[in-house]
């Protein structure tokens, strides 16, 4: 029970995760311009990945996309590349760990697929969620960069009659959803990673065996005191797993790791 | 088409205090942001306050202690409610439309004079 | 507060030539998001409410005529009436569109010589 609860809660936070992610990369607001010590403006600038937009007091807003692909920053390319593989490697592992839930029955799906499915799509969150930390670290270490440049040479102007006050931006709201969804991403891999050993049999050299007293269909087990009626299913040698939780629905009852003789 | 009619202005003590309005027609208030402007006999223009159409308001900060910019979107009818009145607040007092776009007054109403005197 | 600094104070032309006013402001009205001059030019004739002009710095309203045309960016800002005529006696403001409060600048008054 356990194990299927914390694959389902990986699977849930991951999903907030990456629609954080996705958001964060079409929001407008990834820098806005920074207004402190400065006149109180008509016009309020901010800028997203893919557009910067002019919102006026009025209402009217302006938004206009950089339609230029060789023309722009490095770093905000790179910023772009880190979000587009964040959500990519997040959208795959989403449908990987979809199959991948133990609670949804897809055939005769081993669980030790599903196992090996829950880790991919945990290893996938985990990068997803890097990509995306990494993607707004790179865009506010670059903010800062250029926030303490243009302090620096705030107010440049004709013998200090005339300012020309440069635009200095600050962090918008993208960033900080991204860092959550990156973050959120993240936790949800680590937990689907956490979920996977839960789910991962055991593989041994020794096999269970039953013993049979004469007379009697029963088979001894010196472990765990527990007795079931021989030749049944369960006395097939079978995969042993470790005490993970169970499904309410097994009825099979499974050699414990104590039970080897 | 778009109007704007200002009314209230008259002659009033040093120390009171007045209402002017501005009826709307042609637009909605909650569409357009609408400005005061004064402006002294023989002298320029000076803009007073504005309300957008959102609702938010600025002012001139010297006369934001003393004048209130409101308006009544059911009515379509804009304020500028004036207190502690002063001799040198004597003028024609304007409203204007924000044309929406780049910020400047599209459509003014024709003035009404404020004269403060004892 | 920005100040609007407008020259000359009065202009005579005769009709037909151009007339040139000028405006000046303490701060930059461009605005790098959307390299647009928050700036505005009215003309005021006597006993009569301000008519927009120019906005943008640069482009004309709607019914005004072409003769009339708005140049500059950031500090530095030009009204051109091309070929003066009798009806353009007036006086003419700049007006700061960018930061509150929206000043005006001080006028400058057009007279045919």
């Known amino acids: 029970m356990a194990v299927t609860a914390c694959q389902g809660l990986g699977f849930v936070v991951s999903l907030i995760g990456i629609a954080g992610i996705i958001a964060a990369t079409c929001m407008d607001q990834w820098s806005t311009q920074d207004l402190y010590n400065n006149p109180v403006t008509a016009v309020f600038n901010y800028q997203g990945l893919w557009r910067s937009c002019v919102r006026e007091s009025s209402g009217f807003t302006e938004c206009r996309g950089y339609f230029t692909l060789l023309g722009l920053p490095a770093m905000l390319q790179a910023v772009r590349a880190l979000m587009i593989v964040g959500i990519v490697l997040g959208a795959i592992g989403l449908l990987v760990s979809i199959f991948a839930l133990k609670c949804i029955r897809i055939g005769s799906m081993e669980d030790s697929a599903k196992a090996n499915m829950t880790l991919t799509s945990g290893i996938m969150f985990i990068v997803s969620g890097l990509c995306a930390i990494a993607g707004v670290s790179v865009f506010a270490n670059m903010l800062v960069t250029n926030f303490w440049m243009s302090t620096a040479n705030m107010y440049t102007g004709m013998g200090g009659m005339v300012q020309t006050v440069q635009t200095r931006y600050t962090f918008g709201a993208a960033l900080f959803v991204g860092w959550v969804a990156g973050g959120l991403t993240l936790i949800g891999g680590v937990m689907m990673c956490i979920a996977c050993r839960g789910l991962a049999p055991e593989e041994t050299n020794y096999k269970a065996v039953s013993y049979h007293a004469s007379g009697h269909s029963v088979a001894y087990k010196p472990g765990g005191f527990k007795a079931s009626t021989g030749f049944g299913s369960n006395t097939k040698n079978k995969k042993i797993y470790d005490g993970g939780a169970r499904t309410e629905d097994e009825v099979q009852s499974y050699p414990s790791k104590h039970d080897y003789v | 088409q778009v109007q704007l009619v200002e009314s209230g202005g008259g002659v009033v003590q040093p120390g009171r205090s007045l209402r002017l309005s501005c009826a709307a027609s042609?637009?909605?208030?909650?569409?357009?942001?609408v400005y005061w402007v004064r402006q002294a006999p023989g002298k320029g223009l000076e803009w007073v306050a504005v309300?957008?159409?959102?609702?938010?308001?600025n002012y001139n900060s010297a006369l934001m202690s003393r004048f209130t910019i409101s308006k009544d979107n059911s009515k379509s009818t804009l304020y500028l409610q004036m207190n502690s009145l002063r001799a040198e607040d004597t003028a024609v007092y304007y409203c204007?439309?924000?044309?929406?776009?780049?910020?400047?007054?599209?459509?003014w109403g024709q003035g009404t004079l404020v004269t403060v005197s004892s | 507060d920005i100040v609007m600094t407008q020259s000359p104070d009065s202009l005579a032309v005769s009709l037909g030539e151009r007339a040139t006013i000028n405006c000046k402001s303490s701060q930059s009205l461009l605005n790098s998001g959307n390299q647009k001059n928050y700036l505005a030019w009215y003309q005021q004739k006597p006993g009569q409410p301000p008519k927009l002009l120019i906005y943008g710095a640069s482009t004309r309203e709607s019914g005004v005529p072409d003769r009339f045309t708005g140049s500059g960016s950031g500090t530095d800002f030009t009204l051109t009436i091309s070929s003066l005529q009798a009806e353009d006696v007036a006086v003419y403001y700049c007006q700061n569109d960018h930061f509150f409060p929206f000043t005006f600048g001080q006028g400058t008054k057009v007279e045919i010589k």
């Open positions: 042609g637009f909605t208030l909650t569409s357009y942001g």
């Open positions: 309300v957008w159409a959102g609702g938010n308001t």
């Open positions: 204007a439309r924000d044309r929406g776009r780049l910020l400047a007054m599209d459509y």
